[in-house]
């Protein structure tokens, strides 16, 4: 469907089947140059480049990240920008193209053999480092899920929840995303009160499991707004 016609590297950003694993089936891919749009079940070439607005990285394609288009970061709308290739400068993992991550301000290859130890080291280095939270929105690790042939177990690095095994979701942990357990009845959950507030979480919780929703715990109704405890409760 509407994959970002509206971005600077839209050909790379076509949803599968062009990319492989997923997507709307049966799409015919145009070989013409230009930006491609899978509308209905056909791709169509678009002449013009248009940016795509975003509030967080997840709104962008896997080959993009969300940021202000100007270095100074004006108050205007943020847009999806093309990811940075290997050896390019970065401020967080989402800026680096799939298969790479941000280490010491440079996009480096997330070679499967060395990846786990290095990313943990990078997370430790970047924690508390101002420029790693430059835009104040959520971080999406743009590590290629193709690296993982089996569904991620708890603690595995992921891109989206479909990369994780059943009962797990993909949630932020520092500036990366890992598979965490979907919340069970009675567990504390996060209720986002305002737009964009979820972008401030360093340790993001999963959503509540099937048949549950995140609601104020009965005995906490009298508490002040800031201390209200939300738990997963039956509908």
């Amino acid at each position: 469907t509407l994959n970002s016609v509206l971005n600077s590297n839209a050909i790379k950003n076509l949803p599968p089947p062009l990319g492989g694993a997923a997507g709307h089936p049966g799409s015919a891919v145009s070989a013409a140059p230009g930006i491609l749009y899978p509308g209905g079940n056909k791709y169509q070439t678009i002449d013009n480049y248009q940016p795509y607005p975003c509030a967080e990285d997840e709104e962008c394609g896997t080959d993009e990240y969300c940021a202000s288009p100007t270095r100074g970061g004006d108050a205007g709308v943020q847009i999806c920008l093309a990811c940075r290739k290997r050896r390019k400068r970065c401020m967080r993992h989402a800026m680096c193209c799939p298969g790479n991550y941000c280490k010491n301000g440079i996009c480096v290859s997330s070679d499967q053999n060395h990846f786990r130890g290095e990313i943990e080291e990078t997370i430790t280095e970047s924690f508390g480092n101002d420029h790693s939270t430059l835009d104040g929105y959520s971080r999406r690790t743009t590590l290629s899920s193709k690296m993982y042939h089996t569904k991620g177990q708890e603690g595995s690095v992921c891109l989206r929840s479909s990369d994780c095994a059943s009962g797990l979701c993909c949630a932020r942990h520092f500036w990366s995303k890992i598979c965490k357990p979907v919340l069970k009845e009675g567990q504390v959950c996060t209720k986002h009160r305002r737009k964009g507030s979820h972008g401030l979480e360093i340790f993001q919780r999963c959503y509540c499991g099937e048949g549950l929703s995140c609601r104020i715990q009965k005995d906490h109704h009298q508490a002040s707004n800031s201390s209200r405890l939300h738990t997963c409760q039956r509908h």
Partner: antibody
Amino acid sequence: EVQLLESGGGLVQPGGSLRLSCAASGFTFSSYWNHWVRQAPGKGLEWVSTIGPSGTSTYYADSVKGRFTISRDNSKNTLYLQMNSLRAEDTAVYYCAESFRSRYFDYWGQGTLVTVSS
Amino acid sequence: DIQMTQSPSSLSASVGDRVTITCRATQSIRSFLNWYQQKPGKAPKLLIYGQHNRPSGVPSRFSGSGSGIDFTLTISSLQPEDFATYYCQQYYDWPLTFGQGTKVEIK
């Protein structure tokens, strides 16, 4: 073929709850953004809520914030809208929609009618 | 929130007519505007995205223009299947908002 099929609509009293479901098929559900858009009888379209592919990003219209909860189960290819504290003004046909991008409504279901009345 | 206002609310036209619908935003939304078509009893359908781009399968008689605050949907030669209600939608910022709709009726 992409298909979105809503269910769960019906008649409910003010203050009551209802849970809508949207079963998706014909595409890889877990890669796409999903939305609820409603249309009151004889009125225009109103965006209600949006959820990201992983379920971690959610957005709500002010008119439903704190009352409605959007969620998804990627293992079941299903989108949900839990509606609590329903009001007469929530009466509408509720459409689910999907898109590769967050702010479009590319494919739509046929809708399910929710009537809030005493 | 960004409000979207369409005009006219309804119009009557004949097959073959050129029809113009306008949509105005309360602030600049750059080119971040979509148009949808909805026929009675049916779900809406994406008609124009990103201000003037047509999804595959949408006839070339539909075109979009404008930027910033004022936008236009033009149907160059109205066909019988075009009688419907048309909505604009901004995607510059959350919350996503629609115009109130323009109903195109047969004269």
